[in-house]
């Protein structure tokens, strides 16, 4: 009821707290001498439900029966309306609609750690919309009982603040929770448990790892646990993995040997504990320990490839290339690569350690049989050396793969296909597909890429270091013993018409014909592999169609003769370039007049 109503009263029957669906009677009555002046029968009492008028009556009192009230609180206000004046509030009352508490479900209790306190949780069931008090009761041996009350509106957790001890771990305790509100009460089913059932150990702490003799094969994990712990679960994984390895151990006493860790790998370790084989629950996982395992000497062998370049009649340049070992093969930080070059007949050998590169270039005589060995070294040792005999990779024409083609295969991929060589195809031990960006100068600094393919394969998809709109020189080598044959082709993953035409830099006259020289189109403007150049010419000031000459593209070519010009006629000449996607715009225009005699 609104406090201290001077003018009248509002009463609610049977109660101001009702069960959902119940009916209430509301009475508004004026106190003596509180009605309208002069004419009491002019009193008009009006009942409002919040701000909505629901009933009115002339006289000293008003009765109203109300049904269908919603869950929660509804305010009823009674007002008096007199002629020629505003309504005035007489009194008001709230009605609280709710439900009795449901039976609390799934009562469960836990004690965190041997020194912790007993705390219980339960499910309240549906909201009562009324103030509901929860009382938790725990009874134990020797008629001991503890009780705790919860005054939080959404109470589903209580801590008794008492500690169960392991003196009699099999003694039974019983917990029960009771919910009470103005409309009723309800108790949970009792939950009976022992010390071992409810004590959840604290997670292990102070986790450490030791590697005896800095070896990954002698690894022990150490930790600390509460005194009564019997079981442990260990889980560990490489830091970059989502999958855990799991180990269960009994009576570990804070240590366990791990035998299957990979070298030079950062691992994450966690441990959990339990007091009893089949009673109680596992602790939370411990905080993670992160540790890197020691290095081991590399396994596997380097993938090595090479290029030979003729320098002069007595010398040749050898460029060696190799790929990094995978992390699992390197098993540590590679400190250097050891390259040994040996002349097989004379026995002369030269060894060099290479750091920071995966290539090495040297100059050797063109005579003799040469071999190289390359290995990778970390702090623990070296990989087995990869040995290669240096030979002329393209010398055996009969071993050359046939019908080599290179086709775009989606974004930044090129599919290279070939047919086996004419010579007995079964003699091929492996194919090597090599590719590098095409540079008109034949630049030896351009990075080399390669992949190896089994002898029964006749195609390879190359995707490493492939960029759109770049032309690649692709070679396929067939290797057999100490012989090799090769075929080459140009290819690109994506192409469009070149952005510019060649720049004519000179036109010279030679015996009645002309020689046109041009500068190559910059690589970044070629937009793929060039197929042809076109030279156009027409008489100056003429409207006739130009004549043209189409020249197949060759990397090293940058001049071409034309012998169909008339003497003493001034011509305008220009050039374009073509890829499979189309023709470039014109290059620069040059004028030229042939001075030779007319026939």
């Amino acid at each position: 009821k609104i406090d201290a109503c001077k003018r009248g009263d509002v009463t609610v029957k049977p109660s101001h707290v009702i069960l959902l669906g119940s009916t209430v009677n509301i009475t508004c009555s004026l106190k003596p001498r509180q009605g309208c002046f002069h004419y009491s029968r002019r009193n008009k009492l009006i009942l409002y439900k919040f701000d909505r008028r629901i009933n009115f009556h002339h006289g000293h009192s008003l009765n109203s029966q109300v049904t269908g009230l919603p869950l929660g609180t509804t305010l009823f206000v009674c007002k008096l309306a007199c002629i020629n004046s505003d309504e005035i509030q007489i009194c008001g009352a709230e009605i609280f609609v709710g439900v009795a508490p449901e039976q609390p479900q799934n009562l469960s209790c836990i004690q965190k750690g041997e020194q912790g306190t007993v705390a219980c949780t339960w499910e309240r069931g549906r909201d009562t919309h009324l103030y509901t008090e929860y009382t938790l009761q725990l009874s134990g041996p020797k008629n001991l009982t503890w009780q705790k009350q919860c005054k939080d509106i959404y109470c589903d957790y209580l801590d008794f603040g008492i500690n169960l001890t392991p003196e009699s771990p099999e003694s039974n305790f019983t917990a029960k929770v009771t919910a009470v509100n103005s409309l009723g009460s309800s108790s949970s089913l009792p939950s009976t448990f022992t010390f071992l059932d409810i004590v959840r150990p604290l997670p292990p702490w102070d986790i450490r790892i030791k590697f005896q003799k800095a070896s990954v094969s002698r690894c022990t994990l150490y930790w600390r646990d509460e005194g009564l712990v019997l079981l442990n679960r260990l889980r560990y994984r490489p830091s970059n993995s989502r999958l855990w390895n799991m180990v269960n151990v009994t009576k570990a006493k804070g240590r366990h040997d791990l035998l299957d860790l990979k070298p030079f790998t950062e691992y994450e370790f966690q441990i959990s504990s339990k007091l009893h084989l089949y009673k109680g629950s596992w602790s939370d996982w411990s905080e993670s320990l992160r540790a890197q395992t020691p290095e081991e000497e590399p396994t596997g062998m380097l993938d090595v490839w090479y290029m030979k370049r003729h320098i002069d009649y007595s010398r040749q340049q050898i460029s060696l290339f190799w790929k990094n070992l995978s992390v699992s093969e390197a098993r540590g930080k590679i400190l250097h690569y050891q390259v040994t070059l040996q002349e097989l007949t004379g026995g002369k050998a030269m060894t060099q350690n290479i750091t920071g590169h995966t290539s090495w270039t040297t100059v050797i005589p063109r005579t003799g049989n040469w071999a190289v060995a390359v290995s990778a070294a970390n702090s623990k040792g070296s990989s087995l050396p990869t040995r290669i005999n240096i030979m002329n990779l393209c010398e055996a024409g009969l071993l050359a793969p046939r019908q080599v083609s290179a086709n775009s295969e989606g974004m930044d991929n090129i599919l290279v296909t070939w047919q086996p060589p004419r010579k007995d195809p079964s003699a091929v031990q492996e194919y090597v597909v090599e590719w590098r960006e095409l540079h008109p100068g034949g630049d030896t600094q351009v990075p080399l890429n390669w992949l190896r393919s089994r002898p029964y394969n006749v195609s390879a998809l190359i995707s490493e270091n492939i960029k759109s709109y770049i032309c690649y020189e692709i070679r396929v080598y067939a290797l057999s013993g100490d012989q090799g044959g090769c075929s080459s082709i140009l290819g690109n993953s994506k192409h469009k018409a070149p952005l510019s035409g060649p720049h004519i830099n000179a036109i010279t006259e030679e015996k009645g014909s002309i020689l046109i020289s041009w500068n190559s189109i910059p690589v970044q403007e070629q937009m793929g592999c060039l197929l042809h150049y076109r030279i156009y010419w027409k008489e100056r000031d003429s409207n006739s169609q130009p004549q043209l000459c189409e020249i197949p593209y060759r990397v090293s070519q940058n001049s071409h003769p034309i012998n169909s010009l008339q003497p003493r006629v001034t011509y305008v000449l220009w050039m374009t370039a073509l890829t499979a996607a189309g023709e470039s715009s014109h290059g620069n225009e040059r004028e030229f007049c042939l001075q030779g005699k007319a026939n």
């Epitope: 709230e94 009324l130 005054k151």
Partner: nanobody, 115 residues
Framework: QVQLQESGGGLVQPGGSLRLSCTAS????????MDWYRQVPGNQREWVAS???????YYDGSVKGRFTISRDNAKMMVYLQMNSLKPEDTAVYYC?????????WGQGTQVTVSS
């Protein structure tokens, strides 16, 4: 124990605005309505506005269209935004939480509308 504290009252000219706030403590508030009442000296307290836990507002006819009630359950606050104030709105304004165990009232904040 629930405690309520109003603030934001003051002197304002007719036609002006004020915003009253009521800070509450105690978690039971989240299931109950929160109300504003006002009292002129010598008269009884009169209901002004209510808001349900889900935010449904209700107003007395004398303030409807001028006052707005709102609540922030996370901060346990209820507000009364009063616009187009009139001299007859002068009163002490109280915040109230009605429960089935009894009503909780604040101490009140004075609002004076005068030129």
């Amino acid at each position: 124990q629930v405690q309520l504290q109003e603030s934001g009252g003051g002197l304002v000219q007719p036609g002006g605005s004020l915003r009253l706030s009521c800070t509450a403590s105690g978690s039971i508030l989240s299931i109950y309505n929160m109300d504003w009442y006002r009292q002129v000296p010598g008269n009884q307290r009169e209901w002004v506005a209510s808001i349900t836990p889900s935010g449904d507002p209700y107003y007395d006819g004398s303030v409807k269209g001028r006052f707005t009630i709102s609540r922030d359950n996370a901060k346990m606050m209820v507000y009364l935004q009063m616009n187009s104030l009139k001299p007859e709105d002068t009163a002490v304004y109280y915040c109230k939480v009605p429960t089935e165990k009894g009503n909780y009232w604040g101490q009140g904040t004075q609002v004076t509308v005068s030129s």
